[in-house]
């Protein structure tokens, strides 16, 4: 449940150095600068816990500022092998090698890592993100071509004493940024190694890792200003759940965004939105601080617990759900996007659900902490919250069984 | 500035098909849908159907879904439509327009004319 | 299919006049109505949104109301180039439809 046991050397206090080692904003993804290679080339990465590569963009591209030149790094090694991994919609391919990798607002170690080095790719890089590559921070089960490719974090834990342990503190804006703004903004903060104390309030609550390939996890019950949606759980995790700092939304299941909208629909029916908010085409606009966030509901999700028949709920605000956008043509006004989306591949807990939030990846006790994170953006009314615990039972029949195939690893 | 840039007038023969592409600049690409609609000569607007840049999810007017195709590129910010099947009553102006609060931004459009 | 039913199809007017347009969709669409001016060989350009919302830059003499099923745009004083093909749209559900469009003409 809570996290009070005693304190661990190296997993506790203050990590001052990489506070605020994030940028970015949600739409975009959040990137920390990495150096890779001897000479370093400094490069942003995005930071994604819903694939398992460490891969950079190796060459020229319309969309990239500067990228990775191996033949620059006296400590580049081929290993003469590609990967080529294909997404929903796009793909990206490249040549396998490893190179010395740091972070120089992380551990200061230094480490030999896999690196993918992007020759070729679609609809991957975005124009304007400002990130170059991607540091994919899930597990080797997911990673490509295959297993035998030991993931960045993995090949960190191994060569250094670094505990196998990150947590993440995604700061939503609240308002829309411009690319300056994004530039000079502060994102947010991944913790490697441990858990900061200034990044969150509260308790911290746990649950399980189910299956250690993405992050996976169960839901076990869903609410909508407290009504709860009474759905069979499992289809909460139809066919799997996980947490992904690589999406933008909070992504559901077919039913389950069905019936989540419906009852979002009817709490906000005070005004009458468009279809095209709800599927996330148009935009919904008030005039310049007049945003009714009373109108709209609190979402809870309930997570397993790590005791039996006990549960946590996390709730997010309107706030995390209504992404900002800017559009010039309604400039006066503040403008946002449904941030909820309809998914075919399971619940993915997306940048909406973690910006509310601390998330801590304790790979060492296979479970993910959640606290209300001190950087969230609330009204004077209503908060995010973690709370528990909740009795909830019979949440093992919650989890989806996945026929076995091969599963491709996405950021959407 | 946000502009939305179509290619140039089509002549096409009935049965034909044709693909009129629209070049978008000045704001995130992915952040924004794009329409296209349509105009005959001297008549309304007809809206065609739309496209998410970020996924390529579609959605079409029933009119048109079984001979529309909205495609996108992001590597190059172009959205395309293509109309097959094409017979003397599509002769028409067609735009693409980007989404946000209704149609905030149109292309200049784009004549196609089937004519035997 | 919601129609969205524009009157008059054109009208004259002078320079000066005060202008409106009504439209009136065939079921109730909220607030989710727009407007566009079209001048001949050119693509619409936005006016307002949201049934009163002016899009940036767009002239204050432009207004627009209602809600449910009625409503109207106002040209306060018209002025020689707001002489155009006018167009309301809903855009509460799919397929987006737009009224026939009214002609202003100079008297």
């Known amino acids: 449940e809570t996290d009070e046991e005693p304190e661990e050397p190296g997993r506790r206090g203050s990590f001052v150095e990489m506070v605020d080692n994030l940028r970015g904003k949600s739409g975009q993804g959040y990137y920390v600068e990495m150096t890779v290679g001897s000479p370093p080339q400094t490069l942003n990465i995005l930071v994604d816990t819903g694939s398992s590569n460490f891969a950079v963009g190796a060459a020229p591209h319309p969309f990239l500022h500067r990228y990775y030149q191996r033949q620059l790094s006296s400590t580049y090694r081929d290993l003469r092998k590609g990967v080529y991994v294909p997404y929903t919609q796009g793909k990206w391919e490249g040549e396998l090698g490893t190179d010395l990798v740091s972070i120089p607002h992380g551990p200061n170690v230094t480490v030999r890592a896999n690196i993918a080095a992007i020759t070729e790719s679609d609809k991957f890089f975005i124009n304007g993100s400002n990130w170059e590559g991607i540091l994919g921070l899930a597990y080797a089960e997911i990673a490509r071509p295959d297993d035998s490719l030991e993931p960045f974090f993995d090949s960190l834990v191994k060569q250094t004493h670094v505990p196998n342990l990150f947590s993440l503190q995604l700061c939503g804006a609240g308002f829309p940024l411009n690319q300056s703004e994004v530039l000079a903004s502060v994102g947010g903060s991944m913790i490697i190694g441990g858990i900061d104390h200034s990044l969150y309030t509260g308790s911290l609550w746990y649950t399980p890792i189910r299956r250690e390939w993405y992050y996976e996890v169960i839901i076990v019950r869903v609410e909508i200003n407290g009504q709860d949606l009474k759905m069979d759980c499992k289809e909460y995790n139809y066919d799997k759940s996980i947490v992904d700092s690589g999406t933008t939304n909070l992504r559901l299941p077919k039913k389950v965004f069905e019936a989540a909208v419906k009852s979002i629909k009817a709490a906000s029916s005070t005004e009458k939105f468009p279809d095209g908010f709800w599927l996330g085409e148009q935009l919904v606009c008030w005039q310049a601080g007049t945003t009714p966030w009373n109108i709209f509901p609190v979402i809870s999700l309930y997570l397993m617990g790590e005791v039996t028949n006990q549960s946590f709920r996390i709730t997010i605000l309107p706030q995390q759900y209504l992404r900002p956008v800017e559009d010039v043509a309604t400039s006066q006004d503040d403008c946002y996007k449904f941030a909820i989306s309809q998914s075919s591949t399971g619940t993915v807990m997306g940048a909406v659900i973690m910006e509310g939030f601390y998330v801590v990846f304790d790979r060492a006790r296979k479970r993910i902490g959640f606290a209300v994170s001190a950087c969230h953006v609330h009204d004077e009314f209503r908060t995010a919250a973690v709370e528990g615990p909740f009795v909830t039972l019979d949440m093992e029949d919650c989890g989806y069984n996945i026929p076995q195939t091969d599963e491709s690893t996405l950021m959407t | 500035q946000v502009q939305l840039v179509q290619s140039g007038a089509e002549v096409k023969k009935p049965g034909a098909s044709v693909k009129v592409s629209c070049k978008a600049s000045?704001?995130?690409?992915?952040?924004?849908?794009i329409h296209w609609v349509r105009q005959a000569p001297g008549q309304g607007l007809e809206w065609m159907g739309i496209?998410?840049?970020?996924?390529?999810?579609?959605k079409y007017n029933q009119k048109f879904k079984a001979r529309a195709t909205l495609t996108v590129d992001t590597s190059t910010s172009t959205v395309y439509m293509e109309l097959s099947s094409l017979r003397s009553e599509d002769t028409a102006v067609y735009y693409c327009?980007?989404?946000?609060?209704?149609?905030?931004?149109w292309g200049q459009g784009t004549l196609v004319t089937v004519s035997s | 299919d919601i129609q969205m039913t524009q009157s008059p199809s054109s009208l004259s007017a002078s320079v000066g006049d005060r202008v409106t347009i009504t439209c009136k969709a065939s079921?109730?669409?909220?607030?989710?109505v727009a407007w566009y001016q079209q001048k001949p060989g050119k693509s619409p350009k936005s006016l307002i949104y949201?049934?009163?919302h002016r899009y940036s830059g767009v002239p204050s003499r432009f207004s627009g109301s209602g809600s449910g099923t009625d409503f109207t745009l106002t040209i306060s004083s018209l002025q020689p180039e707001d002489f155009a093909t006018y167009f309301c749209?809903?855009?509460?559900?799919?397929?987006?439809?737009f009224g026939q469009g009214t002609k202003v003409e100079i008297k």
């Open positions: 327009a980007r989404s946000g609060v209704a149609f905030p931004y």
């Open positions: 000045g704001y995130t690409f992915t952040n924004f849908w």
């Open positions: 496209i998410d840049p970020s996924d390529s999810y579609t």
């Open positions: 079921q109730d669409v909220g607030r989710n």
């Open positions: 949201s049934a009163s």
């Open positions: 749209q809903q855009y509460n559900s799919y397929p987006y439809t």
